[in-house]
Interface confidence: medium
């Protein structure tokens, strides 16, 4: 069961896996949650009654029964991992710890004006896990204003000590705030020949890449497929690093694949969620239980529901045996990966889906797109909302996109003449406007946040956030879309769609059914040629066919320009303005969302 509260002056006895150092009990709980085996923890706070060498220790624990005996101990704080919980989890930690020196390998030192600048440097440095900043009150003039970037093998400090006039904190890469580039390509027939920091078994290069992404020291990887000539190395995933952050040597080798950690865009890709099934594949590991199951899907469910299960192998039933039920082997290992992978024995293997909640909800696969046609089907665009005004009468005002459980991203120009958020209603999970009746549930708007540089759509900054009065429960018909990663600025999106209930031609009416149109992106240079009287800035993005015919139009404003990349949908643009609708050589102009990621995060993550 899910227990979120911390137990003060309480120590769990036994079950120790490992000890790490964390600056707070709250962060200890996060570390426990992300550790493959940790279910409980005991943290020691600073206290005069405690030996200072034990301050800030975070002991990660495991137990077959999922609990351990409790002992009273001053300064001890204990609790449970969030693995047992169903809510979304994030490793993002923006806290700044005053008078704490988090120790690690100090590999870079430079002068910074503030702790925030130091944290930004850490976030944009490929090796940095955390930092310590000597403030301007630091007594040693020699080290005043010095920003120390640090890393360790585990990503957590090797020790934490009290130190006056310094502050420490963590990299914000896991908060989607890094400007580092994301190299998403997987390179076939390639071996990266740099030093290995770890190796695990993986069924394919994609799982290997995800493991690399959440491993604190991994910058790139090499995976040896099951056809690799050396049998002992088949399915081996080598996690690698280098001083420069890039592979120094690439060797052409058949049946090997290599790629990069997607650390700085992990909020918009699945990292922990390995949802595929691997046929004719057996995962070896420590056996937790053997249960009868009707199918491999049922076996995966059993694994997902057993908190200690990390992966499974299902062996289908022999004809008419055991009521047609096969054997479901629930397994675990020290690192969450199989200890060995065997092929050709008829098993079907996979991973627990319990860890999917550690990924952003926006990365969840949605139902396949309906090809052709202009009318959408239910659940096709689950992030699309219709924003209604109730004054003077209720009507559709603009589109918008769900980007968080309390947040809608839309266009600023939608709120011309809107005096108060009280007159706004947000409807989600809607396909047809006619579904909206008096008693249809909606989300009230608590706050409208318009970009403070917005003047008019054509001059840019046409972006606004709506904070909802209540939170959205994610379902198949209402869920968020991923924001693009700052590291993906150079990605060329080829599968982009504009959606909305807007006009189908310039003089028309709001459509009943949500419309969709696949539209190619246009370069800003090309777009500028089409709009000589306007300044097309890098904060705008354009899309449209040269011959016209498909475009957003009145009523689509604020809605999404959604682009699919690596199986994940990204909110690339917000419908903003254009000359007429679907006119020849007049592309639609959209707010370029990637340029506002910092602004969005600043507003939505404000404490």
């Amino acid at each position: 069961e899910c227990v979120t509260q911390l137990l003060k002056d309480t120590c769990f006895e036994g079950g120790d896996i490992t000890t790490v150092f964390t600056p707070s009990a709250k962060y200890c709980q996060v570390v426990c949650t992300y550790h493959p085996r940790c279910l409980l923890f005991t943290f020691t706070a600073e206290s005069p009654s405690e030996d200072p060498t034990r301050w800030f220790t975070c002991v990660l624990k495991d137990s077959v029964t999922e609990t351990l005996p409790r002992v009273n101990r001053t300064a001890a704080i204990s609790g449970y991992s969030f693995k047992q919980c169903s809510h979304q989890i994030s490793a993002c930690n923006k806290d700044i710890y005053v008078d704490l020196d988090m120790k690690g390998i100090n590999y870079n030192s430079s002068v910074a004006k503030s702790a925030q600048e130091c944290q930004e440097r850490c976030t944009d440095d490929v090796h940095c896990h955390f930092f310590t900043y000597a403030t301007r009150q630091f007594p040693s003039l020699e080290h005043r204003n010095i920003c120390l970037l640090k890393h360790t093998q585990t990503g957590t400090p090797t020790r934490i000590t009290k130190l006056d006039k310094v502050v420490s904190g963590f990299s914000l890469k896991s908060c989607a705030l890094s400007n580092l580039a994301c190299i998403r390509d997987i390179f076939p027939n390639t071996v990266f020949a740099d030093s290995n920091i770890d190796s695990v078994m993986a069924p394919d290069a994609f799982v290997c890449g995800r493991i690399c992404t959440h491993h604190p020291g991994c910058l790139f990887f090499t995976f040896f497929s099951q056809e690799w000539p050396k049998e002992s190395q088949r399915n081996l995933c080598l996690l690698k690093t280098s001083e420069s952050g890039l592979p120094s040597t690439r060797i052409k080798k058949s049946k090997a694949l290599s790629g990069f950690s997607l650390q700085s865009c992990r909020h918009s890709i699945p990292v922990f969620c390995h949802s595929s099934f691997y046929h004719d594949t057996d995962f070896l590991g420590e056996e937790l239980d053997i249960v009868a199951a009707k199918s491999h899907e049922a076996c995966q469910k059993l694994c997902t529901n057993a908190v200690r299960c990390q992966f499974f192998t299902y062996t289908p039933a022999q004809a008419s045996c055991n009521e047609g039920k096969g054997k479901c082997y629930l397994k675990l290992s020290s690192n969450g990966s199989p200890t060995k992978i065997l092929h050709g024995r008829g098993g079907i293997s996979g991973y627990t889906l319990r860890l999917c909640k550690m990924d952003n909800e926006c990365t969840t696969k949605i139902k396949p797109r309906i090809v052709g046609g202009t009318a959408s089907v239910r659940g096709e665009w689950p992030w699309q909302v219709t924003l209604h005004t109730t004054s003077p009468t209720q009507r559709h005002l603009c589109g918008g996109s769900i980007i968080g459980n309390q947040w809608i991203l839309t266009a600023a120009h939608c709120f011309y003449g809107v005096e108060s958020p009280k007159i706004l209603r947000v409807y989600s999970g809607i396909l047809n406007q006619s579904e909206i009746k008096e008693d249809t549930s909606f989300f009230g708007v608590q706050e409208i946040i318009i970009h403070d540089q917005y003047k008019m759509a054509e001059s840019g900054y046409d972006i606004a956030l709506l904070k909802l009065e209540t939170t959205v429960n994610y379902t198949d018909s209402q869920r968020p879309i991923c924001l693009p990663s700052k590291g993906d600025r150079n990605v060329i999106y080829t599968d982009c769609w504009v959606t909305g209930w807007g006009y189908r031609k310039l003089r028309d009416k709001i459509q009943n059914t949500l419309q969709k149109a696949k539209i190619p992106l246009v370069t800003n240079e090309e777009c500028q040629k089409r709009y000589r009287g306007h300044k097309i800035t890098h904060k705008m993005i354009c899309a449209g066919y040269r011959e016209g015919g498909k475009d957003a139009c009145k009523g689509d404003s604020g809605g999404p320009l959604s682009c699919k990349h690596n199986e994940v949908w990204h909110l690339v643009g917000i419908t903003s303005w254009g000359e007429g609708c679907a006119q020849r050589e007049r592309p639609g102009v959209y707010t370029n969302v990637v340029e506002y990621v910092d602004w969005i995060l600043e507003k939505t993550q404000a404490v």
Epitope: D101, T132, A134, S140, I146, L148, T161, D164, V166
Partner: antibody
């Protein structure tokens, strides 16, 4: 590996000048604060001067040498210098150049082997 | 300037002994204290920084403790190569860096 090699020591008369050099290798010289520390024969360690890496104007001296000694560095050649003017008998010592580590607590983590300066008439 | 006072100024001990050297600062220096070892004719070598952190490559028989004004360096079991002079150094309020006068550790 980190290496610091001092040179330029010798016998000099009171009132005269001497320039000590320290050649650094094995680390990114320009990123580190550099010190001179001295040790009179049979005595303890005495800090002399520091040159901060991040600000060319940040040079600091012990009261005993202020106005007479000048610390300088050439980052393009990975060299640290100590220009000693108006030398006195009490300046007789082994002079060490030392690198300051980037721990939050400043430390002198690497030292040269030292060069002996004897001020005598 | 902060004054550092070491005691004793010299001491004799045998191989295998546990030895403690103390260092006192003229005002509180938090844990901004380092310890160095110097052998005759050689440059000093950093042993312990920030009062209690062991510099990499230094044997674990060396340990440091203390905070504020009083600090100690302990050698749990003396080895022949440990006979040398030991200096404490404050890096709390610098410049100037100030050293203790040194403690000479001799073979009994």
């Amino acid at each position: 590996q980190v290496q610091l090699v001092e040179s330029g020591g010798g016998v000099v008369q009171p009132g005269r000048s001497l320039r000590l050099s320290c050649a650094a290798s094995g680390f990114t010289f320009s990123s580190y604060n550099m010190h001179w520390v001295r040790q009179a024969p049979g005595k303890g360690l005495e800090w002399v001067a520091i040159f901060l890496s991040y600000d060319g104007s940040n040079k600091y001296y012990a009261d005993s040498v202020k106005g007479r000694f000048t610390i300088s560095r050439d980052n393009s050649r990975d060299m640290l210098y100590l220009q000693m003017n108006s030398l006195r008998a009490e300046d007789t010592a082994v002079y060490y150049c030392a690198k300051s580590e980037i721990l939050v607590v400043p430390t002198l983590d690497y030292w040269g082997q030292g060069t002996l300066v004897t001020v005598s008439s | 300037d902060i004054q550092m006072t070491q005691s004793p100024s010299s001491l004799s001990a045998s191989v295998g002994d546990r030895v403690t050297i103390t260092c006192r600062a003229s005002q509180s220096i938090s844990s901004y204290l380092n310890w160095y070892q110097q052998k005759p004719g050689k440059a000093p070598k950093l042993l312990i920084y920030a009062a209690s952190s062991l510099q990499s490559g230094v044997p674990s028989r060396f340990s440091g403790s203390g905070s504020g004004t009083d600090f100690t360096l302990t050698i749990s079991s003396l080895q022949p190569e440990d006979f040398a002079t030991y200096y404490c150094q404050q890096s709390y309020s610098t410049p100037p860096i100030t050293f203790g006068q040194g403690t000479r550790l001799e073979i009994k």
